[in-house]
């Protein structure tokens, strides 16, 4: 029975050329997280955090993606093309998969509003 919930940073905006943290948090479950997948709006995988093997950043994103903090992901050197949906998929035992959605808007303006549904400590 899937009792858990995924909280995400929700809809966020960031400045072109800057960086942004994508963060998901799984709560309300005793399930064990075995892998977290991060993917982009076109379903291409950005990165995987495997419980045993650690982080794997996919080659196309190696220069612009940094692992962490925690199970999150940091996108750097943002371009306008980075605007869109991002998904975290938590593979958990024995619950199954939990999926969270974040919408990132990359702004041309010098000042970008940054709103989040929760603060990362």
């Amino acid at each position: 029975m899937m009792t858990g919930t995924i909280e995400t940073t929700g809809n966020i905006s960031a400045k072109k050329g800057g960086s942004v943290i994508l963060q998901c948090h799984l709560s309300s479950t005793m399930a064990q997280v075995t892998q977290v997948n991060w993917e982009q709006h076109d379903h291409s995988l950005l990165a995987i955090r495997n419980a045993e093997l650690g982080w794997h950043i996919y080659p196309a994103f190696k220069d612009r993606v940094a692992p962490g903090p925690g199970l999150g992901l940091t996108l750097q050197s943002l371009t306008m093309n980075d605007t869109g949906e991002y998904f975290c998929t938590y593979h958990t035992y024995p619950d199954g998969t939990y999926r969270g959605r974040i919408f990132l808007e990359v702004l041309e303006s010098s000042v970008a509003e940054h709103s989040a549904r929760f603060q990362i400590p």
Epitope: Q32, T34, Y93
Partner: antibody
Amino acid sequence: EVQLVQSGSDLKKPGASVRVSCKASGYTFTSYPMNWVRQAPGHGLEWMGWINTNTGNPTYVQGFTGRFVFSLDTSVNTAYLQISSLKAEDTAVYFCARTGGHTYDSYAFDVWGQGTMVTVSS
Amino acid sequence: DIQLTQSPTFLSASVGDRVTITCRASQVISSSLAWYQQNPGKAPKLLIYAASTLQSGVPSRFSGSGSGTEFTLTISSLQPEDFVTYYCQHLHGYPYNFGQGTKVEIK
């Protein structure tokens, strides 16, 4: 080599307690959930439940609540099963088994301990 | 709870035979099914996971197929060491039950 090594067979009297240990080696203990499976003589396999090796939180299948306790000592990469107030019907082989596979569609019990025979008899 | 029913419970066959064991689930479990082999007095050994993926080190004469509610384990050519007991297990929705087992005996 990835392996799980369990403690030896035990003979106990009704009402006593027993602790079965399961020592893991060859992998990162806290990266894989650990399960316990019972097999009564001449019978099939019964999943008793599992323990989250990250948090130590145990989950028990219906029928294995109350007298059964799963625990861990991560400093020595060992999982434990304790059974209290033993009854004759607890006589069985108890196995620990690692959940292998990292994605939900590939989970399975990929590494098993050799089993520990617990006999309850007066 | 999802129940698994294996058939047959006993199977008599000869060395070299092709045999098939069926596992039926009481509800749809996608491809979340594993097959295990157990020798008497030994721990089970994982043969197949995700319904059809052969576990590393397992001989290629073993294969698995199916999805949804009906699954099969096939041994293409029985070897003397294959005359043991086989179990299916679903890993889709708690609790992860096992089938009752199929004992393969020498005819």
